[in-house]
Interface confidence: low
Protein backbone atom coordinates (compact mmCIF):
# COMPACT_ATOMS: atom_id res chain seq x y z
CA UNK A 1 0.00 0.00 0.00
CA UNK A 2 0.95 3.68 -0.07
CA UNK A 3 0.05 6.97 1.59
CA UNK A 4 -1.73 9.70 -0.34
CA UNK A 5 -1.26 13.28 0.86
CA UNK A 6 -0.50 16.73 -0.53
CA UNK A 7 2.88 18.36 -0.81
CA UNK A 8 1.44 21.71 0.24
CA UNK A 9 -1.83 22.61 1.91
CA UNK A 10 -2.70 26.30 1.57
CA UNK A 11 -5.27 27.97 3.79
CA UNK A 12 -6.27 31.54 4.55
CA UNK A 13 -5.79 32.82 8.08
CA UNK A 14 -8.77 31.89 10.24
CA UNK A 15 -9.97 29.10 7.98
CA UNK A 16 -9.83 25.39 8.80
CA UNK A 17 -6.97 23.42 7.26
CA UNK A 18 -7.57 19.85 6.17
CA UNK A 19 -4.37 17.85 6.54
CA UNK A 20 -4.85 14.87 4.21
CA UNK A 21 -3.43 11.41 4.88
CA UNK A 22 -5.11 8.46 3.19
CA UNK A 23 -3.75 4.91 3.17
CA UNK A 24 -4.43 3.22 -0.15
CA UNK A 25 -3.92 -0.40 0.85
CA UNK A 26 -4.51 -3.83 -0.58
CA UNK A 27 -7.63 -5.81 0.17
CA UNK A 28 -7.85 -6.85 3.79
CA UNK A 29 -5.32 -4.34 5.09
CA UNK A 30 -6.30 -2.28 8.12
CA UNK A 31 -5.12 0.98 9.68
CA UNK A 32 -4.46 0.64 13.40
CA UNK A 33 -3.52 4.20 14.20
CA UNK A 34 -2.43 7.47 12.63
CA UNK A 35 -0.07 9.81 14.48
CA UNK A 36 0.17 13.46 13.40
CA UNK A 37 3.15 15.58 14.42
CA UNK A 38 4.68 18.90 13.52
CA UNK A 39 8.24 18.36 12.32
CA UNK A 40 9.79 21.73 11.48
CA UNK A 41 13.50 21.62 10.69
CA UNK A 42 15.77 22.17 13.67
CA UNK A 43 13.02 21.47 16.19
CA UNK A 44 11.87 18.25 17.75
CA UNK A 45 8.63 16.67 16.61
CA UNK A 46 5.56 18.05 18.39
CA UNK A 47 2.61 15.70 18.58
CA UNK A 48 -0.71 17.02 17.32
CA UNK A 49 -3.02 14.07 17.61
CA UNK A 50 -3.30 10.32 17.64
CA UNK A 51 -6.12 8.71 15.68
CA UNK A 52 -6.77 5.16 16.92
CA UNK A 53 -9.06 2.79 15.09
CA UNK A 54 -10.49 1.55 18.39
CA UNK A 55 -10.10 4.42 20.86
CA UNK A 56 -10.78 7.33 18.52
CA UNK A 57 -9.07 10.71 18.46
CA UNK A 58 -6.67 11.87 21.16
CA UNK A 59 -5.50 15.49 20.79
CA UNK A 60 -2.35 16.69 22.50
CA UNK A 61 -2.87 19.49 25.07
CA UNK A 62 -1.14 22.09 22.88
CA UNK A 63 -3.80 21.55 20.21
CA UNK A 64 -6.80 20.92 22.46
CA UNK A 65 -10.00 22.04 20.75
CA UNK A 66 -8.24 22.72 17.45
CA UNK A 67 -7.78 19.29 15.91
CA UNK A 68 -10.80 17.29 14.77
CA UNK A 69 -11.65 14.46 12.44
CA UNK A 70 -13.47 15.41 9.25
CA UNK A 71 -17.23 15.00 9.51
CA UNK A 72 -18.70 11.53 8.82
CA UNK A 73 -18.99 9.36 6.84
CA UNK A 74 -15.35 8.39 7.41
CA UNK A 75 -13.29 5.79 5.62
CA UNK A 76 -11.35 3.64 8.14
CA UNK A 77 -8.27 4.07 5.92
CA UNK A 78 -8.51 7.88 6.06
CA UNK A 79 -6.23 9.46 8.66
CA UNK A 80 -6.90 13.05 7.64
CA UNK A 81 -7.50 15.65 10.36
CA UNK A 82 -8.87 19.20 10.46
CA UNK A 83 -6.83 21.96 12.06
CA UNK A 84 -9.35 24.59 13.10
CA UNK A 85 -8.91 28.34 12.70
CA UNK A 86 -5.40 28.31 11.24
CA UNK A 87 -3.03 30.98 12.51
CA UNK A 88 0.34 32.09 11.21
CA UNK A 89 2.18 30.08 13.83
CA UNK A 90 0.67 26.91 12.34
CA UNK A 91 2.70 27.33 9.15
CA UNK A 92 5.29 24.60 8.78
CA UNK A 93 5.95 20.91 8.12
CA UNK A 94 3.59 18.17 9.31
CA UNK A 95 4.01 14.41 9.24
CA UNK A 96 1.49 11.64 9.41
CA UNK A 97 2.69 8.19 10.51
CA UNK A 98 0.30 5.38 9.69
CA UNK A 99 0.53 1.98 11.38
CA UNK A 100 -1.13 -0.70 9.26
CA UNK A 101 -1.71 -4.40 9.62
CA UNK A 102 -0.14 -6.43 8.22
CA UNK A 103 1.92 -4.11 5.96
CA UNK A 104 3.62 -2.13 8.76
CA UNK A 105 4.29 1.60 9.08
CA UNK A 106 4.23 4.37 6.49
CA UNK A 107 4.88 8.08 6.80
CA UNK A 108 4.37 11.16 4.67
CA UNK A 109 5.05 14.87 5.04
CA UNK A 110 3.23 17.96 3.93
CA UNK A 111 3.79 21.68 4.27
CA UNK A 112 1.03 23.89 5.67
CA UNK A 113 1.04 27.38 4.23
CA UNK A 114 -1.10 29.98 5.99
CA UNK A 115 -1.96 32.96 3.83
CA UNK A 116 -2.45 36.17 5.79
CA UNK A 117 -4.48 38.53 3.60
CA UNK A 118 -3.33 42.12 3.87
CA UNK A 119 -5.48 44.94 5.22
CA UNK A 120 -4.00 47.86 3.30
CA UNK A 121 -3.89 51.41 4.55
CA UNK A 122 -3.45 54.52 2.44
CA UNK A 123 -1.91 57.62 3.98
CA UNK A 124 -2.06 60.91 2.07
CA UNK A 125 1.18 62.89 1.95
CA UNK A 126 1.56 66.54 2.93
CA UNK A 127 -0.80 69.12 1.43
CA UNK A 128 -0.19 69.42 -2.30
CA UNK A 129 0.40 72.92 -3.65
CA UNK A 130 1.00 74.09 -7.16
CA UNK A 131 4.58 75.17 -7.64
CA UNK A 132 6.06 72.46 -5.46
CA UNK A 133 8.59 70.10 -6.99
CA UNK A 134 8.28 66.33 -6.82
CA UNK A 135 6.08 65.72 -3.76
CA UNK A 136 4.73 62.66 -1.94
CA UNK A 137 1.04 62.34 -2.85
CA UNK A 138 0.29 59.20 -0.84
CA UNK A 139 1.82 56.06 0.58
CA UNK A 140 0.12 52.70 0.74
CA UNK A 141 1.13 49.95 3.16
CA UNK A 142 0.00 46.34 3.23
CA UNK A 143 1.29 43.57 5.46
CA UNK A 144 0.64 39.93 4.79
CA UNK A 145 2.10 36.50 4.28
CA UNK A 146 3.45 36.03 1.71
CA UNK A 147 4.41 39.62 0.89
CA UNK A 148 1.59 41.39 -0.95
CA UNK A 149 2.05 43.31 -4.19
CA UNK A 150 1.28 47.04 -3.98
CA UNK A 151 0.78 49.05 -7.17
CA UNK A 152 -1.01 52.25 -8.22
CA UNK A 153 -3.82 52.85 -10.69
CA UNK A 154 -4.26 56.46 -11.81
CA UNK A 155 -4.35 58.75 -14.84
CA UNK A 156 -2.02 61.15 -13.03
CA UNK A 157 1.64 61.24 -14.06
CA UNK A 158 3.98 60.36 -11.24
CA UNK A 159 6.71 58.09 -9.98
CA UNK A 160 6.51 55.21 -7.54
CA UNK A 161 8.98 53.70 -5.11
CA UNK A 162 8.52 50.62 -2.95
CA UNK A 163 10.20 49.13 0.06
CA UNK A 164 9.63 45.95 1.98
CA UNK A 165 10.11 45.06 5.64
CA UNK A 166 10.37 41.40 6.53
CA UNK A 167 8.98 40.24 9.86
CA UNK A 168 9.28 36.77 11.32
CA UNK A 169 6.10 35.48 9.69
CA UNK A 170 5.02 38.22 7.31
CA UNK A 171 6.23 41.11 5.22
CA UNK A 172 5.06 44.71 5.04
CA UNK A 173 5.26 46.44 1.68
CA UNK A 174 5.03 50.22 1.41
CA UNK A 175 4.71 51.98 -1.93
CA UNK A 176 4.93 55.74 -2.31
CA UNK A 177 3.50 57.78 -5.17
CA UNK A 178 5.27 61.06 -5.95
CA UNK A 179 4.09 63.74 -8.38
CA UNK A 180 4.63 67.36 -9.38
CA UNK A 181 1.39 69.03 -8.26
CA UNK A 182 -0.65 70.93 -10.82
CA UNK A 183 -4.17 72.32 -10.72
CA UNK A 184 -5.31 69.85 -13.41
CA UNK A 185 -4.86 67.06 -10.87
CA UNK A 186 -7.65 68.34 -8.65
CA UNK A 187 -10.32 65.74 -8.04
CA UNK A 188 -8.36 63.01 -9.83
CA UNK A 189 -8.41 59.57 -8.19
CA UNK A 190 -5.22 57.90 -7.03
CA UNK A 191 -5.89 54.24 -6.27
CA UNK A 192 -3.67 51.85 -4.34
CA UNK A 193 -4.09 48.28 -5.62
CA UNK A 194 -3.07 45.40 -3.36
CA UNK A 195 -2.77 41.87 -4.74
CA UNK A 196 -2.27 38.75 -2.66
CA UNK A 197 -2.92 35.03 -3.11
CA UNK A 198 -5.21 35.12 -0.07
CA UNK A 199 -7.51 37.66 -1.74
CA UNK A 200 -10.26 36.62 -4.13
CA UNK A 201 -9.77 39.93 -5.89
CA UNK A 202 -7.45 42.90 -5.59
CA UNK A 203 -8.12 45.34 -2.79
CA UNK A 204 -8.37 48.95 -3.89
CA UNK A 205 -8.23 52.10 -1.77
CA UNK A 206 -8.84 55.37 -3.54
CA UNK A 207 -7.59 58.79 -2.52
CA UNK A 208 -8.89 61.92 -4.27
CA UNK A 209 -6.16 64.42 -5.02
CA UNK A 210 -6.47 68.03 -3.85
CA UNK A 211 -3.96 70.53 -5.13
CA UNK A 212 -4.03 74.05 -3.69
CA UNK A 213 -3.50 76.84 -6.19
CA UNK A 214 -4.55 80.38 -6.94
CA UNK A 215 -4.69 81.75 -10.47
CA UNK A 216 -3.55 85.27 -11.39
CA UNK A 217 -6.30 87.85 -10.85
CA UNK A 218 -7.62 90.18 -13.53
CA UNK A 219 -10.37 92.79 -13.66
CA UNK A 220 -13.04 92.93 -16.35
CA UNK A 221 -15.32 95.88 -17.11
CA UNK A 222 -12.97 98.51 -18.47
CA UNK A 223 -12.65 97.08 -21.97
CA UNK A 224 -14.41 100.15 -23.43
CA UNK A 225 -13.22 103.23 -21.53
CA UNK A 226 -15.75 105.39 -23.39
CA UNK A 227 -18.56 103.72 -21.47
CA UNK A 228 -17.23 105.16 -18.21
CA UNK A 229 -18.78 108.61 -18.44
CA UNK A 230 -20.69 110.83 -16.04
CA UNK A 231 -24.26 109.68 -15.49
CA UNK A 232 -23.83 106.10 -16.70
CA UNK A 233 -25.84 103.58 -14.73
CA UNK A 234 -25.03 99.93 -14.01
CA UNK A 235 -21.26 100.24 -14.33
CA UNK A 236 -19.40 97.40 -12.65
CA UNK A 237 -15.98 95.83 -12.27
CA UNK A 238 -15.61 92.05 -12.01
CA UNK A 239 -12.57 90.31 -10.56
CA UNK A 240 -11.59 87.08 -12.26
CA UNK A 241 -9.58 84.32 -10.61
CA UNK A 242 -9.91 80.70 -9.64
CA UNK A 243 -8.41 78.58 -6.94
CA UNK A 244 -8.54 75.58 -4.69
CA UNK A 245 -9.79 76.12 -2.05
CA UNK A 246 -12.22 78.56 -3.70
CA UNK A 247 -10.93 82.10 -3.12
CA UNK A 248 -12.56 85.04 -1.42
CA UNK A 249 -12.53 88.58 -2.88
CA UNK A 250 -12.00 91.98 -1.38
CA UNK A 251 -12.12 95.41 -3.05
CA UNK A 252 -10.26 98.54 -1.98
CA UNK A 253 -9.33 101.85 -3.55
CA UNK A 254 -5.67 102.86 -3.50
CA UNK A 255 -6.15 106.60 -3.55
CA UNK A 256 -8.82 106.81 -0.88
CA UNK A 257 -11.85 105.07 0.58
CA UNK A 258 -14.45 103.44 -1.64
CA UNK A 259 -16.92 106.15 -2.70
CA UNK A 260 -20.33 106.11 -1.07
CA UNK A 261 -22.92 104.14 -2.96
CA UNK A 262 -20.39 101.66 -4.38
CA UNK A 263 -21.56 98.08 -3.63
CA UNK A 264 -19.16 95.22 -2.99
CA UNK A 265 -20.75 91.88 -3.91
CA UNK A 266 -18.04 89.22 -3.70
CA UNK A 267 -16.04 89.39 -6.90
CA UNK A 268 -18.10 92.30 -8.27
CA UNK A 269 -17.89 96.04 -7.56
CA UNK A 270 -21.13 97.84 -8.53
CA UNK A 271 -21.28 101.60 -9.08
CA UNK A 272 -24.16 104.04 -8.70
CA UNK A 273 -24.67 106.57 -11.58
CA UNK A 274 -21.11 107.61 -12.33
CA UNK A 275 -19.64 110.91 -11.19
CA UNK A 276 -16.08 112.20 -11.38
CA UNK A 277 -15.57 111.18 -7.74
CA UNK A 278 -15.64 107.55 -8.92
CA UNK A 279 -12.38 108.09 -10.79
CA UNK A 280 -9.48 106.36 -9.02
CA UNK A 281 -7.32 103.25 -8.69
CA UNK A 282 -9.29 100.15 -7.63
CA UNK A 283 -7.66 96.98 -6.30
CA UNK A 284 -9.15 93.54 -6.31
CA UNK A 285 -7.53 91.36 -3.61
CA UNK A 286 -8.05 87.58 -4.09
CA UNK A 287 -6.99 85.10 -1.43
CA UNK A 288 -7.33 81.53 -0.26
CA UNK A 289 -5.47 79.41 2.30
CA UNK A 290 -2.73 78.83 -0.23
CA UNK A 291 -1.91 82.29 -1.56
CA UNK A 292 -3.16 85.77 -2.41
CA UNK A 293 -3.16 87.87 -5.58
CA UNK A 294 -3.87 91.50 -6.43
CA UNK A 295 -5.02 93.18 -9.60
CA UNK A 296 -5.49 96.92 -9.94
CA UNK A 297 -7.17 99.09 -12.55
CA UNK A 298 -7.52 102.83 -13.05
CA UNK A 299 -11.00 104.18 -13.58
CA UNK A 300 -11.20 107.55 -15.32
CA UNK A 301 -14.78 108.80 -15.46
CA UNK A 302 -15.17 110.98 -18.53
CA UNK A 303 -17.04 114.26 -18.65
CA UNK A 304 -18.42 114.37 -22.21
CA UNK A 305 -18.41 118.18 -22.26
CA UNK A 306 -14.84 118.38 -21.04
CA UNK A 307 -13.83 115.77 -23.59
CA UNK A 308 -15.35 117.66 -26.52
CA UNK A 309 -13.62 120.83 -25.32
CA UNK A 310 -10.32 119.04 -25.10
CA UNK A 311 -10.78 117.64 -28.55
CA UNK A 312 -11.30 121.16 -30.02
CA UNK A 313 -8.19 122.36 -28.20
CA UNK A 314 -6.21 119.47 -29.56
CA UNK A 315 -7.37 120.19 -33.09
CA UNK A 316 -6.56 123.91 -32.83
CA UNK A 317 -3.17 123.14 -31.35
CA UNK A 318 -2.27 121.08 -34.36
Amino acid sequence: GELETSDVVTVVLGQDAKLPCFYRGDSGEQVGQVAWARVDAGEGAQELALLHSKYGLHVSPAYEGRVEQPPPPRNPLDGSVLLRNAVQADEGEYECRVSTFPAGSFQARLRLRVLVPPLPSLNPGPALEEGQGLTLAASCTAEGSPAPSVTWDTEVKGTTSSRSFKHSRSAAVTSEFHLVPSRSMNGQPLTCVVSHPGLLQDQRITHILHVSFLAEASVRGLEDQNLWHIGREGAMLKCLSEGQPPPSYNWTRLDGPLPSGVRVDGDTLGFPPLTTEHSGIYVCHVSNEFSSRDSQVTVDVLDPQEDSGKQVDLVSAS
Partner: antibody, heavy 119, light 112 residues
Protein backbone atom coordinates in the same frame (compact mmCIF):
# COMPACT_ATOMS: atom_id res chain seq x y z
CA UNK B 1 -25.74 54.45 -0.04
CA UNK B 2 -25.14 50.94 1.28
CA UNK B 3 -28.17 49.15 2.75
CA UNK B 4 -28.50 45.73 4.36
CA UNK B 5 -31.60 43.52 4.34
CA UNK B 6 -31.98 40.30 6.34
CA UNK B 7 -34.27 37.52 5.11
CA UNK B 8 -35.17 34.01 6.20
CA UNK B 9 -37.84 32.00 8.03
CA UNK B 10 -39.29 33.56 11.16
CA UNK B 11 -39.98 30.20 12.80
CA UNK B 12 -37.52 27.34 13.32
CA UNK B 13 -38.12 24.08 15.17
CA UNK B 14 -35.82 23.06 18.05
CA UNK B 15 -32.75 21.03 17.00
CA UNK B 16 -33.07 22.27 13.42
CA UNK B 17 -30.84 24.75 11.59
CA UNK B 18 -31.55 28.47 11.47
CA UNK B 19 -30.64 29.95 8.07
CA UNK B 20 -30.61 33.67 7.29
CA UNK B 21 -29.35 35.72 4.36
CA UNK B 22 -28.21 39.34 4.30
CA UNK B 23 -28.41 41.15 0.95
CA UNK B 24 -26.10 44.10 0.43
CA UNK B 25 -27.44 46.80 -1.91
CA UNK B 26 -26.02 50.15 -2.95
CA UNK B 27 -22.45 48.88 -2.81
CA UNK B 28 -20.26 45.84 -3.28
CA UNK B 29 -19.73 43.13 -0.71
CA UNK B 30 -16.15 42.84 -2.05
CA UNK B 31 -14.61 44.81 0.76
CA UNK B 32 -15.16 45.27 4.47
CA UNK B 33 -16.16 42.82 7.21
CA UNK B 34 -19.74 41.54 7.34
CA UNK B 35 -21.20 40.62 10.71
CA UNK B 36 -24.14 38.91 12.36
CA UNK B 37 -25.41 40.15 15.71
CA UNK B 38 -28.44 39.01 17.66
CA UNK B 39 -30.68 40.38 20.37
CA UNK B 40 -32.97 38.12 22.41
CA UNK B 41 -36.33 39.74 23.29
CA UNK B 42 -35.87 42.42 25.95
CA UNK B 43 -32.14 41.73 26.22
CA UNK B 44 -28.84 43.14 25.01
CA UNK B 45 -26.78 42.62 21.87
CA UNK B 46 -24.55 39.60 21.21
CA UNK B 47 -22.01 39.50 18.40
CA UNK B 48 -22.14 36.18 16.54
CA UNK B 49 -19.28 36.43 14.07
CA UNK B 50 -17.91 38.07 10.97
CA UNK B 51 -17.00 37.20 7.45
CA UNK B 52 -14.21 39.02 5.66
CA UNK B 53 -15.28 39.25 2.04
CA UNK B 54 -12.48 36.97 0.81
CA UNK B 55 -14.14 34.18 2.79
CA UNK B 56 -12.25 34.27 6.08
CA UNK B 57 -14.59 33.84 9.05
CA UNK B 58 -14.30 34.26 12.78
CA UNK B 59 -16.94 33.43 15.32
CA UNK B 60 -17.82 34.22 18.90
CA UNK B 61 -16.36 31.30 20.90
CA UNK B 62 -19.68 30.87 22.72
CA UNK B 63 -21.37 29.91 19.42
CA UNK B 64 -18.45 28.67 17.33
CA UNK B 65 -19.37 24.99 17.38
CA UNK B 66 -22.81 25.72 15.88
CA UNK B 67 -22.31 28.65 13.51
CA UNK B 68 -21.25 29.05 9.89
CA UNK B 69 -21.10 32.31 7.96
CA UNK B 70 -20.56 32.17 4.20
CA UNK B 71 -20.51 34.58 1.26
CA UNK B 72 -21.94 34.61 -2.26
CA UNK B 73 -20.18 37.52 -3.96
CA UNK B 74 -22.07 36.99 -7.22
CA UNK B 75 -25.36 37.74 -5.44
CA UNK B 76 -23.85 40.34 -3.07
CA UNK B 77 -25.10 38.27 -0.13
CA UNK B 78 -23.74 36.64 2.98
CA UNK B 79 -25.46 34.02 5.10
CA UNK B 80 -25.73 32.71 8.63
CA UNK B 81 -26.37 29.10 9.59
CA UNK B 82 -26.89 28.20 13.25
CA UNK B 83 -27.53 24.52 13.88
CA UNK B 84 -29.06 22.59 16.78
CA UNK B 85 -31.14 25.59 17.83
CA UNK B 86 -33.01 25.83 21.11
CA UNK B 87 -35.47 28.34 22.56
CA UNK B 88 -32.45 30.32 23.80
CA UNK B 89 -31.67 31.17 20.17
CA UNK B 90 -34.93 33.08 19.79
CA UNK B 91 -33.87 36.63 18.93
CA UNK B 92 -33.85 39.45 16.45
CA UNK B 93 -30.92 38.75 14.12
CA UNK B 94 -29.11 41.71 12.56
CA UNK B 95 -26.50 41.85 9.85
CA UNK B 96 -24.05 44.76 10.01
CA UNK B 97 -20.99 46.08 8.23
CA UNK B 98 -17.62 46.88 9.76
CA UNK B 99 -14.94 49.00 8.17
CA UNK B 100 -11.53 48.07 6.79
CA UNK B 101 -10.70 46.42 10.08
CA UNK B 102 -13.09 44.19 11.95
CA UNK B 103 -13.05 46.47 14.97
CA UNK B 104 -14.16 49.52 12.98
CA UNK B 105 -17.43 48.34 14.28
CA UNK B 106 -20.89 48.22 12.76
CA UNK B 107 -21.36 51.51 10.92
CA UNK B 108 -24.31 50.15 8.89
CA UNK B 109 -27.04 47.80 10.16
CA UNK B 110 -29.93 45.91 8.63
CA UNK B 111 -33.39 46.42 10.09
CA UNK B 112 -33.29 42.98 11.74
CA UNK B 113 -35.41 39.86 11.41
CA UNK B 114 -37.16 38.11 14.28
CA UNK B 115 -36.54 34.36 14.55
CA UNK B 116 -38.57 32.27 16.97
CA UNK B 117 -37.48 28.76 17.93
CA UNK B 118 -40.55 26.76 18.81
CA UNK B 119 -42.14 23.44 17.98
CA UNK C 1 -14.01 37.67 27.34
CA UNK C 2 -13.84 41.34 28.22
CA UNK C 3 -16.88 42.28 30.33
CA UNK C 4 -18.49 45.65 29.61
CA UNK C 5 -20.48 47.07 32.52
CA UNK C 6 -22.86 49.96 31.94
CA UNK C 7 -24.46 52.17 34.56
CA UNK C 8 -27.04 53.18 35.41
CA UNK C 9 -29.39 50.52 34.07
CA UNK C 10 -32.12 53.14 33.76
CA UNK C 11 -31.67 56.88 33.36
CA UNK C 12 -34.79 59.05 33.80
CA UNK C 13 -34.10 62.50 32.33
CA UNK C 14 -35.85 65.83 31.92
CA UNK C 15 -36.18 67.27 28.42
CA UNK C 16 -33.58 69.96 27.80
CA UNK C 17 -31.39 68.77 30.67
CA UNK C 18 -28.02 66.99 30.35
CA UNK C 19 -27.59 63.25 30.78
CA UNK C 20 -24.52 61.12 31.34
CA UNK C 21 -23.93 57.37 31.36
CA UNK C 22 -20.91 55.22 32.15
CA UNK C 23 -19.26 52.18 30.59
CA UNK C 24 -16.49 50.22 32.27
CA UNK C 25 -14.40 47.42 30.79
CA UNK C 26 -12.74 44.59 32.66
CA UNK C 27 -9.49 45.23 30.74
CA UNK C 28 -7.88 48.30 29.19
CA UNK C 29 -9.21 49.00 25.71
CA UNK C 30 -6.03 50.72 24.48
CA UNK C 31 -4.93 48.85 21.36
CA UNK C 32 -1.41 48.35 20.02
CA UNK C 33 -2.07 50.64 17.04
CA UNK C 34 -2.64 53.58 19.40
CA UNK C 35 -6.43 53.54 19.01
CA UNK C 36 -9.01 52.72 21.65
CA UNK C 37 -11.85 50.79 20.07
CA UNK C 38 -14.79 51.82 22.23
CA UNK C 39 -18.05 52.51 20.41
CA UNK C 40 -21.47 53.76 21.49
CA UNK C 41 -24.74 52.68 19.87
CA UNK C 42 -28.25 54.07 20.20
CA UNK C 43 -31.28 51.82 19.83
CA UNK C 44 -34.59 53.64 19.67
CA UNK C 45 -37.72 51.61 20.50
CA UNK C 46 -38.54 49.20 17.69
CA UNK C 47 -35.50 50.14 15.62
CA UNK C 48 -32.14 48.59 14.85
CA UNK C 49 -29.06 49.98 16.59
CA UNK C 50 -27.24 52.96 15.13
CA UNK C 51 -23.62 53.84 15.79
CA UNK C 52 -23.21 57.24 17.44
CA UNK C 53 -19.57 57.31 18.51
CA UNK C 54 -16.53 55.31 17.41
CA UNK C 55 -13.04 55.16 18.89
CA UNK C 56 -14.19 56.81 22.16
CA UNK C 57 -14.99 60.31 20.91
CA UNK C 58 -15.52 60.42 17.13
CA UNK C 59 -19.10 61.27 16.18
CA UNK C 60 -20.59 59.51 13.17
CA UNK C 61 -21.90 61.70 10.37
CA UNK C 62 -25.45 62.87 11.01
CA UNK C 63 -25.14 62.47 14.79
CA UNK C 64 -26.14 65.70 16.59
CA UNK C 65 -23.30 67.47 18.40
CA UNK C 66 -25.19 67.22 21.68
CA UNK C 67 -23.74 63.69 21.89
CA UNK C 68 -20.14 63.40 23.04
CA UNK C 69 -17.94 60.53 24.14
CA UNK C 70 -14.91 60.59 26.39
CA UNK C 71 -12.69 58.35 28.49
CA UNK C 72 -9.62 56.15 28.29
CA UNK C 73 -8.29 52.84 29.55
CA UNK C 74 -11.24 51.16 31.23
CA UNK C 75 -13.61 54.08 32.02
CA UNK C 76 -15.78 55.72 29.37
CA UNK C 77 -18.67 58.17 29.34
CA UNK C 78 -21.40 59.16 26.90
CA UNK C 79 -22.95 62.58 27.49
CA UNK C 80 -26.04 64.20 26.02
CA UNK C 81 -25.81 67.95 26.59
CA UNK C 82 -29.56 68.65 26.21
CA UNK C 83 -31.88 65.66 26.03
CA UNK C 84 -34.53 65.74 23.31
CA UNK C 85 -37.57 63.48 22.97
CA UNK C 86 -35.96 61.56 20.09
CA UNK C 87 -33.09 60.51 22.37
CA UNK C 88 -35.27 58.00 24.21
CA UNK C 89 -33.99 54.45 23.86
CA UNK C 90 -31.25 52.10 25.00
CA UNK C 91 -27.57 53.01 24.66
CA UNK C 92 -24.97 50.29 24.35
CA UNK C 93 -21.20 50.50 24.56
CA UNK C 94 -19.10 47.96 22.68
CA UNK C 95 -15.40 47.16 22.69
CA UNK C 96 -13.45 46.09 19.62
CA UNK C 97 -9.98 45.88 21.12
CA UNK C 98 -10.11 42.35 22.49
CA UNK C 99 -11.38 39.16 20.94
CA UNK C 100 -14.30 38.55 20.85
CA UNK C 101 -16.18 41.82 20.40
CA UNK C 102 -18.46 42.41 23.40
CA UNK C 103 -21.34 44.75 24.23
CA UNK C 104 -22.41 46.28 27.50
CA UNK C 105 -25.83 45.48 28.92
CA UNK C 106 -27.24 48.88 27.97
CA UNK C 107 -28.55 52.02 29.65
CA UNK C 108 -32.21 52.85 29.10
CA UNK C 109 -32.88 56.58 28.70
CA UNK C 110 -36.47 57.63 29.41
CA UNK C 111 -38.24 60.92 29.96
CA UNK C 112 -39.35 61.69 33.53
Amino acid sequence: QVQLQESGPGLVKPSETLSLTCTVSGGSISSYFWNWIRQPPGKGLEWIGYLYYIGTTNYNPSLKSRVTISVDTSKNQFSLKLNSVTAADTAVYYCARSGNYYNDAFDIWGQGTMVTVSS
Amino acid sequence: DVVMTQSPLSLPVTLGQPASMSCRSSQSLAYSDGNTYLNWFQQRPGQSPRRLIYKVSNRDSGVPDRFSGSGSGTDFTLKISRVEAEDVGVYYCMQGTHWPLTFGGGTKVEIK
